[in-house]
């Protein structure tokens, strides 16, 4: 009977999770006569097979990364292999599952701030890329700071923005912070996917190397 | 060894029928179209039309849509071609041909019939 | 319908010479779907080259086919006795099938 996974030849979509062992067929395709036989063309990749009778599959499993649709055309040819319907166009939408761990660009990152600079506003930019979608949580990346060296009273001069990467100061940072103390920090720098809001989530961390420079401008004597 | 082998000549007045029949051996006789062909006197070859056995389906060429009729018997391997209203212009050696397996991906004329002579006069 | 034109219709030659004959097409056709037969007086057509290229069952190697879209060739290379015949292409790309009105090889 035709039903979910049966009927005539048609423009159709369907929506597949990357990274699954291919376990079940995608769709049996029903031939009206003259039509005996069916043909696969487009974007197969050796993955995608259709068997002469309309039995849609896919022989191995899927990856997002390397196409994240697949386009393909079935037609229906009768016993002298002359196309007789299609072809139709048949999409594999391939869906994302988060395989893939984020990266930074650099294990490490150098650079330098004056002192007493605005907070907030950034000085340094650490960036991470994951190849999994960013439209989904998988590729959703969550920046944030492990660990400040030296760490004084307890206090963070540092702050990070958790999605874009960004490096400032903080109020304390641009109140306290004085090369002639203190003239080098370091920062452990991690970035998580899943927008970091799972324990599923992969991560990657990074070194930030920040020297501190002398504000050499002075305040105008009354 | 393949074969198709072909009734023998005929000789027909104009306005009536001929049926020619092509048996075939040495394949399964299901997993094959069989299609038929004329070739006029001096002239070129011409195709009539094909029928695939396993389905009962039949396409003709439009110039001899109506006029012909294939058919096949499963039980004697047998095809047959039966073309009505003659005319002189029908005279000609009809062939039966068959391509390769129906699941195959290069399809020619692989077999042919030995041919069978029609001639139509008054 | 497909009109398949070849040339020449006829073409006296002798044993050992190198032939061409040309099939065009009137639409652009896949290679795959021309077909040349061969045909001596009295006898049933039988394949020579199928797909455009691949030598049919039995047929010798100085039998060669080539071309693409509307235009194809069938060449032999060095002619023998026994190929002075009538040579037809085919089209298998829609129906109805047709062929080429014919290529007559005659003995110089």
């Known amino acids: 009977q035709e039903g979910k996974f049966s009927g005539p030849l048609k423009p159709m979509t369907f929506s597949i999770y990357e990274g699954q062992e291919p376990s079940q067929i995608i769709f049996q395709f029903k031939a009206n006569p003259p039509a005996v036989t069916f043909e696969l063309t487009g974007e197969t990749d050796n993955i995608f097979v259709i068997e002469r009778e309309g039995l849609l599959y896919y022989n191995r499993a899927l990856d997002r990364e390397t196409r994240s649709t697949h386009n393909l055309q079935v037609a229906a040819l009768d016993a002298n292999g002359i196309i007789v319907e299609g072809p139709v166009p048949i999409t594999i939408k391939v869906k994302d599952i988060n395989d893939n761990r984020p990266t930074f660009l650099q294990s490490k990152y150098e650079g330098s701030v004056r002192q007493n600079s605005r907070p907030g506003k950034p000085f340094l930019y650490v960036n991470a890329t994951d190849l999994d979608d960013p439209a989904t949580p998988n590729g959703q990346l969550y920046y944030q700071i492990v660990i400040q060296l030296p760490m004084i009273n307890n206090v963070m001069y540092f702050q990070i923005n958790n999605k874009t990467g960004a490096i400032s100061l903080t109020r304390e940072g641009s109140q306290e912070l004085n090369p002639a103390k203190n003239p080098s920090y370091n920062l452990v720098i991690s970035v998580k996917d899943m927008g970091g809001q799972s324990e599923n989530s992969f991560s990657d961390t990074t070194s930030v190397d920040i020297i501190v420079t002398e504000n050499i401008w002075k305040a105008p004597k009354p | 060894q393949v074969q198709l082998v072909q009734s023998g000549a005929e000789v027909k007045k104009p306005g009536s029928s001929v049926k020619i029949s092509c048996k075939v051996s040495g394949y399964t006789f299901t997993d094959h179209t069989i299609h038929w062909m004329r070739q006029a006197p001096g002239q070129g070859l011409e195709w009539i039309g094909y029928i695939f056995p396993r389905d009962d389906i039949v396409v003709y060429a439009q110039k001899f849509q109506g006029r012909a009729t294939l058919t096949a018997d499963k039980s004697t391997s047998t095809a047959y071609m039966e073309l009505s209203s003659l005319r002189s212009e029908d005279t000609a050696v009809y062939y039966c041909?068959?391509?390769?397996?129906?699941?195959?991906?290069?399809?020619?004329?692989?077999?042919w019939g030995q041919g069978t002579t029609l001639t139509v006069s008054s | 319908d497909i009109q398949m034109t070849q040339s020449p219709s006829s073409l006296s030659a002798s044993v050992g010479d190198r032939v061409t004959i040309t099939c065009r097409v009137s639409s652009i056709i896949s290679s795959s779907k021309l077909h040349w037969y061969q045909q001596k007086p009295g006898k049933a057509p039988k394949p020579l080259i199928y797909g455009t290229s691949t030598l049919a069952s039995g047929v010798p190697s100085r039998f060669s086919g080539s071309g693409s879209g509307t235009d194809y060739t069938l060449t032999i290379s060095s002619l023998q006795p026994e190929d002075f015949a009538t040579y037809y292409c085919?089209?298998?790309?829609?129906?109805?099938?047709?062929f080429g009105q014919g290529t007559k090889l005659e003995i110089k």
């Open positions: 085919q089209q298998w790309s829609n129906y109805p099938f047709t």
């Open positions: 041909a068959r391509p390769p397996y129906y699941y195959s991906r290069n399809f020619y004329f692989d077999y």
